[in-house]
């Protein structure tokens, strides 16, 4: 049948299951004259054969674990053996069957973990291999803890990453492990292939012994440091210690201060490096970090608290160059004229900022001195001797000494004598009627203008009008601004209106003066006005408590772990249903009722962090209005990616014969996070048998040189296996292959004597 099993010579790919005895031909190539025969080259392994007439077949069962892809070339030759078509690539992909069981690399593992280690941070890896294809379930391994001994209160202290075999503490383990109570644990770990999902999966088990060690990496007690210290700096104030020697300590200033006056030495001793100023900053919170030689954090940072103790280094300050008060002509003795409030930058509610007030001078001294007194501690000015007369003395100036326990400051007060306040404000109308507004009316909107008048002396506290809402607005949704020139009041919306809590509000305004009324005059009904505010319903969408919710987890958390939660409320009080939108990787699920977010698949920082999805809150019932917020999941790196080659290195060649040993440079990379100094790979040959012919030498953390050890190589392709280790915790290793061809060269390129019908030689790398 032309097409499926036979046809012209062209690049083709065939897939054949391993382990099956040959039952049919693979393909029948048809020759076009002058081609008369076919030749097969490449990775035939004496399994693949082509007959001269073009019949391609295999003669025994394939084994994917020996070779997963056979790269073959088929050429059509004329009667003289000259290539007239091709060679074309024929790829045989060997499909996997589950014919290998997973096996742990060790029957017993031993490890140790410090108490209070970060939950989810791996301290030990178990590793199993399965020769089957990891891209199929046959080779997908699933790790599980079968048993933890001892098991206290049925609580698991340890967890394993199903995918990577990374063992870490659970949150409970981080909090409760204590070497004084229980210094050792044993885990039985199983590994299954088929991703653990099939009854037909193969499995293996291993035993893990874990020692719990004490953690001395603890935050020190808060430190108190007196400001403006004159002692020689730096001064040691506290210390931290990592559990093992050799840690590199550093301090992290989360507040990003313009000057950060602390340092740490390589013993872990923490110093203040310069005098502190409490008035600039009264407390510092920063972090001590311990890192390994590669700059990777060894554990969580410790929070260091420094409180700056106050000294009396600030004098009192006046509120303004001159403070102005008004007093009415006939005001009675003892009446309050106003309060002078001076400030002191020293610590509140201490002797350093406790102030005393004293009048040191009055001008003019008419009709006498001592007309005013000031309360020593409160700073309240009172009329002391008699009523004042505006026509005799319209203005008095006082000099007031304000002192703390060490410093004195002079402040100046001007007191203006004004007419008596014997007229009350009178509203132009007592009822401003009804006003209907939708509950979503904008904040800041002016909804009503009110007006009262006062016949007292203009532009004094006796005639100035202040409007207050004294009834009907306990939530403070409304406010009144006064125009100081016209005494017009503008009623504005200060907070959102809400139909659900206040559909009708009966508002009462009061108009009053800042100055007290004279004895015998009182505010009456003329100084009050009312209006009715009617709020209409607008169905509002649920409201999230935050615009962006953020959570941080290690990328190797177990499936089903809670990674965060969101909250929203519906203004109408309806129930809310939560859902996710834009979970393109299928990593998360949300509890529709509680808003808790869980992982449902293995997370991968290398696929992108933070992982951003939208959370949707929808009213249940009603008009099903919804609103959207962002959930950002920050994934913290674990070392779960083995090194690999940074690019495709097919086409490497040396001209044959070698006149002198040669070398070539290659680059490695991996997808994990490399903070500070980048990767630190080490390189070695992948098998001992290569060492007679090749050597590999490290150039830097990412590049290495592959060199030939001699010149006696055959004219063919060599596949050199290189082992690359990332030195991570735990170290991961990748074995990569560099194909290197030794070939006859023409003008610096590989030559193969053959051509199309014209006979032009094929030249390539």
């Amino acid at each position: 049948q032309e097409g499926k099993f036979s046809g012209p010579l062209k690049p083709m790919t065939f897939s054949i299951y391993e382990g099956q005895e040959p039952s049919q031909i693979i393909f029948q190539f048809k020759a076009n004259p002058p081609a008369v025969t076919f030749e097969l080259t490449g990775e035939t392994d004496n399994i693949f054969v082509i007959e001269r007439e073009g019949l391609l077949y295999y003669n025994r069962a394939l084994d994917r674990e020996t070779r997963s892809t056979h790269n073959l070339q088929v050429a059509a030759l004329d009667a003289n053996g000259i290539i007239v078509e091709g060679p074309v690539p024929i790829t045989i992909k060997v499909k996997d069957i589950n014919d290998n069981r997973p096996t742990f690399l060790q029957s017993k593992y031993e490890g140790s973990v410090r108490q209070n280690s970060r939950p989810g941070k791996p301290f030990l890896y178990v590793n199993a291999t399965d020769l089957d294809d990891p891209a199929t379930p046959n080779g997908q391994l699933y790790y599980q803890i079968v048993i933890q001994l001892p098991m206290i209160n049925n609580v698991m202290y340890f967890q394993i990453n199903n995918k990577t075999g990374a063992i870490s503490l659970t949150r409970e383990g981080s909090q409760e492990l204590n070497p004084a109570k229980n210094p050792s644990y044993n885990l039985v770990i199983s590994v299954k292939d088929m991703g653990g999902q099939s009854e037909n999966s193969f499995s293996d088990t291993t035993s893990v012994d874990i020692i719990v060690t004490e953690n001395i990496w603890k935050a020190p007690k808060p430190v108190e440091m007196v400001e403006n210290s004159t002692d020689p700096h730096p001064i040691k104030i506290t210390q931290v210690r990592w559990n093992d020697p050799g840690a590199q300590y550093s301090l992290v200033d989360k507040e990003k201060l313009p000057r950060f006056p602390f340092s740490i030495d390589q013993e872990g001793d923490i110093y203040v490096t310069q005098p502190l100023d409490r008035e600039e900053k009264d407390a510092y919170v920063f972090y001590a970090v311990a890192k390994d030689e590669y700059g990777k954090p060894l554990s969580y940072p410790l929070e260091i608290h420094v409180k700056v103790k106050d000294i009396n280094d600030n004098p009192p300050t006046c509120p303004s160059p001159v403070t102005v008060f008004e007093v009415q002509e006939n005001e009675r003795l003892g009446n309050s004229i106003g309060t002078l409030t001076a400030h002191d930058r020293d610590e509140e509610n201490t002797a350093n900022s406790f102030l005393n007030y004293r009048i040191v001078e009055q001008t003019p001294k008419l009709p006498m001195d001592g007309l005013f007194l000031i309360q020593t501690y409160a700073g309240m000015l009172q009329l002391a001797k008699q009523s004042l007369k505006k026509q005799d003395t319209p203005q008095y100036n006082l000099t007031i000494e304000v002192s703390d326990k060490d410093f004195k400051t002079l402040c100046f007060v001007q007191i203006n004598v004004i007419d008596i306040n014997d007229q009350i404000p009178i509203f132009e109308k007592s009822d401003y009627g009804n006003l209907t507004l939708a509950e979503d009316t904008n904040i800041g909107s002016t909804i009503l203008t009110i007006q009262a008048t006062d016949a007292d002396e203009p532009f004094t506290g006796s005639s100035k009008i202040l409007y207050h809402i004294i009834k009907g607005d306990s939530e403070g949704r409304l406010g009144v601004d006064t125009d100081p020139h016209t005494n017009t009041g503008y009623v504005i919306i200060k907070k959102p209106l809400d139909f659900e809590t206040a559909a009708v509000s009966n508002i009462v305004f009061k108009a009053e003066n800042p100055e007290p009324l004279v004895f015998g005059v009182k505010y009456n009904a003329s100084s009050f006005a009312k209006f009715t505010l009617i709020v209409t319903d607008v169905n509002e969408a649920p409201q999230f408590s935050q615009h962006v919710f953020q959570a941080k987890v290690s990328e190797d958390v177990a499936i089903g772990t809670k990674v965060g939660n969101v909250t929203a409320k519906d203004p109408e009080g309806l129930d809310i249903s939560y859902s996710l939108r834009g979970d393109t990787r299928g990593w998360l699920k949300i509890d529709h009722v509680t808003g808790e977010i869980f992982s449902v698949a293995p997370l991968d920082r290398e696929a992108g962090s933070p992982y951003r999805v939208q959370v949707v809150a929808t009213e249940v019932g009603g008009s099903s209005l919804s609103s959207v917020s962002e959930f950002h999941l920050i994934l913290m790196d674990v070392n779960d990616n083995p090194p690999r080659l940074a690019k495709d290195y097919t086409g490497l060649f040396f001209c044959h014969p070698l006149s002198a040993p040669g070398s070539l440079i290659f680059e490695a990379t991996d997808d994990d996070q490399h903070l500070f100094r980048g990767p630190h790979f080490t390189f070695s040959l992948g098998s001992g048998s290569l060492q007679n012919d090749w050597e590999v030498s490290k150039i830097n953390g990412t590049h290495a040189r592959l060199s030939t050890r001699h010149t006696e190589f055959e004219e063919r392709e060599y596949v050199v296996l290189i082992r690359i280790n990332d030195g991570g915790r735990p170290p991961l290793e990748g074995i990569v292959s560099l194909p290197v061809t030794f070939c006859s060269c023409v003008e610096g390129s590989c030559f193969r004597p053959a051509g199309h019908q014209t006979g032009i030689p094929t030249v390539g790398m």
């Epitope: 004259p33 008369v36 030759l77 000259i82 006859s744 030559f751 004597p753 051509g755």
Partner: antibody, heavy 123, light 107 residues
Framework: EVQLQQSVAELVKPGASVKMSCKVS????????IHWMKQRPEQGLEWIGY????????GYNEKFKGKATLTADTSSSTAYMQLNSLTSEDSAVYFC????????????????WGQGTTLTVSS | DIVMTQSQKFMSTTVGDRVNITCKAS??????VAWYQQKPGQSPKLLIY???NRYTGVPDRFTGSGSGTDFTLTITNMQSKDLADYFC?????????FGGGTKLEIK
């Protein structure tokens, strides 16, 4: 022992045709191509073409198309070259040769030659 | 067509000499070149194939070298029985072509 035996000499008149033979022994004719070359006195060799006796496939030098016709008779293990419309320019020694090659070793060459047929075109 | 040029039609030599016979191709032929020896009244005999491989039974004083467009046949320790015509041939591209030949003579 592989041998290629050619007819020794041919004397023909201008305008006529001639068919010279190349009989092989020591191997099977159908296993290799037979090539024909022309050599004039004090001159180099010229490649005329080849025949693959197994299936009669032929390949010619463009210069000799219409002049030479290559055939083979497997039953007598003999290859033939017929030259027509002969002129004095066709007077030369004509060699047949076996093209032996090993694809695996990229080895290609004429490993056995006939002793040559001398063609004289004269009136 | 690819032209194979043997620039020296004749070369004078002495027994024991080292002789270099050159052949230049008009375009790149890789290593698809053979060398043949022809004595008067005889058919050609194969010496070298694939530019540098010595054919079975050929004395090791015959060496071929070169690739691309420039090729050399070297005879070290020249013998009197080596007096003959030497031809190069390319089989990279049809039509196959021969060089004009170089005849070795005694000085």
């Amino acid at each position: 022992e592989v041998q290629l035996q050619q007819s020794v000499a041919e004397l023909v008149k201008p305008g006529a045709s001639v068919k010279m033979s190349c009989k092989v022994s020591g191997y099977t004719l159908t296993d290799h191509t037979i090539h024909w070359m022309k050599q004039r006195p004090e001159q180099g060799l010229e490649w005329i073409g080849y025949i693959y006796p197994r299936d009669g496939i032929t390949g010619y030098n463009e210069k000799f198309k219409g002049k030479a016709t290559l055939t083979a008779d497997t039953s007598s293990s003999t290859a033939y070259m017929q030259l027509n419309s002969l002129t004095s320019e066709d007077s030369a020694v004509y060699f047949c040769a076996r093209w032996g090659y090993s694809y695996r070793n990229y080895a290609y060459y004429y490993d056995y030659w006939g002793q040559g047929t001398t063609l004289t075109v004269s009136s | 067509d690819i032209v194979m040029t043997q620039s020296q039609k004749f070369m004078s030599t002495t027994v024991g000499d080292r002789v270099n016979i050159t052949c230049k191709a008009s375009q790149n032929v890789g290593t698809a070149v053979a060398w043949y020896q022809q004595k008067p009244g005889q058919s050609p005999k194969l010496l070298i194939y694939s530019a540098s491989n010595r054919y079975t039974g050929v004395p090791d004083r015959f060496t071929g070298s070169g690739s691309g467009t420039d090729f050399t046949l070297t005879i070290t320790n020249m013998q009197s029985k080596d007096l003959a015509d030497y031809f190069c041939q390319q089989y990279s591209s049809y039509p196959w072509t021969f060089g004009g030949g170089t005849k070795l003579e005694i000085k």
